[in-house]
């Protein structure tokens, strides 16, 4: 429709246009986590604030039970940052003991769940070895990319160790998505 | 307006549509910083290139005095990367001296200032301990997320230590925002 | 066109509107790399999966021979993550040998090639020293920003060392762009 005038013609059907302001969007922020039991080899999912402070959901993008629900098919930009913190790493203790260095690691995964599909799909992964020498460490992992999602898809953020997630400030750990 | 033809009806008022090309947008790039006095417990703000090289502002998004000025209310994607570099870290010096390991850290904050509100709002924070063993280190912190902003809001990027910011290349340290 | 009704007037030419769904977009994912000869002081380019799994190109955004081809002028958001992994670092070996600490580094560059311009333009760079103490390390570098591109521009992702790139999973290393 580039540069085309809208002439009064009943015959002409235009490509689907829509106001940008009514697109599904969400920005979720960290809350204090309640550690829960999870299956071995399956990372626990974070839960989120969806309406207080900087957090919001709008235009039928809903948050429920750790999931962002996709209300409409299309291409979405999805992002998350998780800030991890710890007080020394096993790696440095192992190093001091002179044993082989198996590094600790921190991992964030943005996962898509489609009810009609048995297995979740990992959309994005950020993973980092942590072999700090100092006794206290903290660092963020940021992820963001575009994906084609279907109405009814659900998105969640999983982490390798929920007890290392910094939940103290809403600007440090967050999760969002918007329809392009 | 999905799939709807534009029939010649004066009665029908459509949702606000707008050309994507006329939305406020900016990509700012690093310049050499002039260290300035700042308040205790308040990180200094970076200033930016806004028209040379890769940098631009358009559609009423203006840059002035370290701030990006938001010309129109709406949901914006805001991002920044700051590359830091340093010579060894206090942490490793402390370690060598056998004293307790207090880590150095590097921090980036994207801050919103609203004239009608007394306190700035921290939108995004990336913070990382730096406890490098090597004598020279460098690393980026990247941030990006979506926020609902109001006309007149101002955005800036604050860093924990302006003297550690790598200002040598426009692709290493940058700041941008665009209306969705 | 905010809040304006589309009255049947042949005189009125509207700003270029276009359906969001027909904008050029691509998300490319990592594949196993074939190390190729590259010029000294020039980082090798990664090649990508463009149609299997999470990868796609659409609306005239094409991928060919390591390049994303820009089919239409405009402002694009461009992003990439590269996950690197290695076995110990030269830095720690140098340290053990008591020689000066020249850190290893890992670097990602998103580069624009314009046929009419002799030199590629570096749009984004993420560079990090790697001076790990543990014997195995892995970490991502993420980049993303908005740029004004011209029809015919080509985008690629270059890395400092192709042999350190983790090509094992499509969610760890990826490259994308979309017209805003």
């Amino acid at each position: 429709l580039k540069g085309q005038e809208f002439a009064p013609s009943h015959q002409q059907v235009y490509a689907p246009l829509r106001a940008d302001g009514d697109k599904p969007r969400a920005h979720l922020t960290v809350v204090r986590q309640t550690p829960t039991q999870h299956f071995k080899n399956q990372f626990p999912a974070l839960h989120w604030e969806h309406e207080l402070g900087l957090a919001f959901t709008k235009n039928r993008m809903n948050y429920t039970n750790k999931f962002l629900l996709i209300p409409e098919s299309g291409d979405y930009f999805i992002y998350s940052q998780v800030t991890f913190r710890g007080m020394t790493s096993e790696c440095s203790e192992i190093r001091q003991a002179g044993r082989p260095n198996k590094p600790d690691s921190i991992t964030v995964v943005i996962t898509k769940v489609t009810d009609s599909y048995p297995e979740p799909t990992q959309l994005l992964m950020g993973t980092k070895s942590v072999c700090e020498v100092g006794s206290n460490w903290f660092q963020p992992i940021y992820l963001g990319a575009m994906f084609s999602l279907q109405e009814g898809d659900k998105l969640m953020v999983n982490v390798s160790d929920i007890s290392l997630v910094d939940y103290t400030k809403e600007d440090k750990t967050f999760f969002g998505a918007f329809l392009l | 307006l999905k799939g709807q033809e534009f029939a010649p009806s004066h009665q029908q008022v459509y949702a606000p549509l707008r050309a994507d090309g006329d939305k406020p947008r900016a990509h700012l790039t690093v310049v050499r910083q002039t260290p300035t006095q700042h308040f205790k417990n308040q990180f200094p703000a970076l200033h930016w290139e806004h028209e040379l090289g890769l940098a631009f502002t358009k559609n009423r998004m203006n840059y002035t005095n370290k701030f990006l000025l938001i010309p129109e209310s709406g949901d914006y994607f805001i991002y920044s990367q700051v590359t830091f570099r340093g010579m060894t870290s206090e942490c490793s010096e402390i370690r060598q001296a056998g004293r307790p390991n207090k880590p150095d850290s590097i921090t980036v904050v994207i801050t919103k200032v609203t004239d009608s509100y007394p306190e700035p709002t921290q939108l995004l924070m990336g913070t990382k301990s730096v406890c490098e063993v090597g004598s020279n280190w460098f690393q980026p912190i990247y941030l990006g997320a979506m926020f609902s902003l109001q006309e007149g809001d101002k955005l800036m990027v604050n860093v924990s230590d302006i003297s550690l910011v790598d200002y040598t290349k426009e692709d290493k340290t940058f700041f941008g925002a665009f209306l969705l | 066109l905010k809040g304006q009704e589309f009255a049947p007037s042949h005189q009125q030419v509207y700003a270029p509107l276009r359906a969001d769904g027909d904008k050029p977009r691509a998300h490319l994912t990592v594949v196993r790399q074939t190390p190729t000869q590259h010029f000294k002081n020039q980082f090798p380019a990664l090649h990508w999966e463009h149609e299997l799994g999470l990868a796609f190109t659409k609306n005239r955004m094409n991928y060919t021979n390591k390049f994303l081809l820009i089919p239409e002028s405009g402002d694009y958001f461009i992003y990439s993550q590269v996950t690197f992994r290695g076995m110990t670092s030269e830095c720690s070996e140098i340290r053990q040998a008591g020689r000066p600490n020249k850190p290893d580094s890992i670097t990602v560059v998103i580069t624009k090639v314009t046929d009419s311009y002799p030199e590629p333009t570096q749009l984004l760079m993420g560079t990090k020293s790697v001076c790990e103490v543990g014997s195995n390390w892995f970490q991502p570098i993420y980049l993303g920003a908005m740029f004004s591109l011209q029809e015919g521009d080509k985008l690629m992702v270059n890395v400092s060392d192709i042999s350190l790139v983790d090509y094992t999973k499509e969610d760890k290393t990826f490259f994308g762009a979309f017209l805003l």
Epitope: P35, T36, M87, S89, I162 | N41, P103 | -
Partner: antibody
Framework: EVQLVESGGGLVKPGGSLRLSCAAS????????MNWVRQAPGKGLEWISS????????YYADSVKGRFTISRDNAKNSLYLQMNSLRAEDTAVYYC???????????WGQGTLVTVSS | DIQMTQSPSSLSASVGDRVTITCRAS??????LNWYQQKPGKAPKLLIY???SLQSGVPSRFSGSGSGTDFTLTISSLQPEDFAAYYC?????????FGGGTRVEIK
């Protein structure tokens, strides 16, 4: 309801040993970090040790490092503190406490008194 | 180690009073600051975590503020059950350290 019950305190001579236990119920013990905090009579609170949910990380205050050992048995929902080479200054009420991410101590036991005296 | 200095060490106040207790860290601790209440013969109870977040079940008359090195616990209207000792604690780095405590007594 979250419950933490400490046991194993008592009177011990200087140089002696004691093993404190903390029995947890009402929450998923294996997912929480656990801590020992002590309080000498009439004094303030002193953190002495922490253990990660999976025992990957152990932390100690300098005042007890090398003498005390923290451990846990997730199958038994139990936390332990093995105290060796006890000194008079270790006399205190010992509390076990949960934490979620090394931020705060959100649940506490009622404490057990350890008295080191000859 | 990070030293935590609380003031005052004790104070006398009446029911209904607004009470403020301050805590200062020897170095910046961001918002890694918690407040606890302890009554005689009882275990401490978490009131405020991360400088300003109210622990579930704690009355809203308790509030916390501050970041960096200076922090405040405020009781907006003192109630009879609030007479107790109050401790601040930093969780920025190990060793985790507490302030010396503030005893709030009935005037």
């Amino acid at each position: 309801e979250v419950q933490l019950v400490e046991s194993g305190g008592g009177l011990v001579k200087p140089g002696g040993s004691l093993r404190l236990s903390c029995a947890a119920s009402g929450f998923t013990f294996s997912t929480y970090n656990m801590n020992w905090v002590r309080q000498a009579p009439g004094k303030g609170l002193e953190w002495i040790s922490s253990i990660h949910s999976s025992s990957n990380y152990l932390y100690y205050a300098d005042s007890v490092k090398g003498r005390f050992t923290i451990s846990r048995d997730n199958a038994k929902n139990s936390l332990y503190l093995q105290m060796n080479s006890l000194r008079a200054e270790d006399t205190a009420v010992y509390y076990c406490a949960t934490d979620r991410a090394m931020v705060d101590f959100d649940y506490w036991g009622q404490g057990t008194l350890v008295t080191v005296s000859s | 180690d990070i030293q935590m200095t609380q003031s005052p060490s004790s104070l006398s106040a009446s029911v209904g009073d607004r009470v403020t207790i301050t805590c200062r860290a020897s170095q910046s601790i961001s918002t890694y600051l918690n407040w606890y209440q302890q009554k005689p013969g009882k275990a401490p109870k978490l009131l405020i975590y991360a400088a300003s977040s109210l622990q579930s079940g704690v009355p809203s008359r308790f509030s916390g503020s501050g970041s960096g090195t200076d922090f405040t616990l405020t009781i907006s209207s003192l109630q009879p059950e609030d007479f107790a000792a109050y401790y601040c604690q930093q969780s920025y780095s190990t060793p985790l350290t507490f302030g010396g405590g503030t005893r709030v007594e009935i005037k």
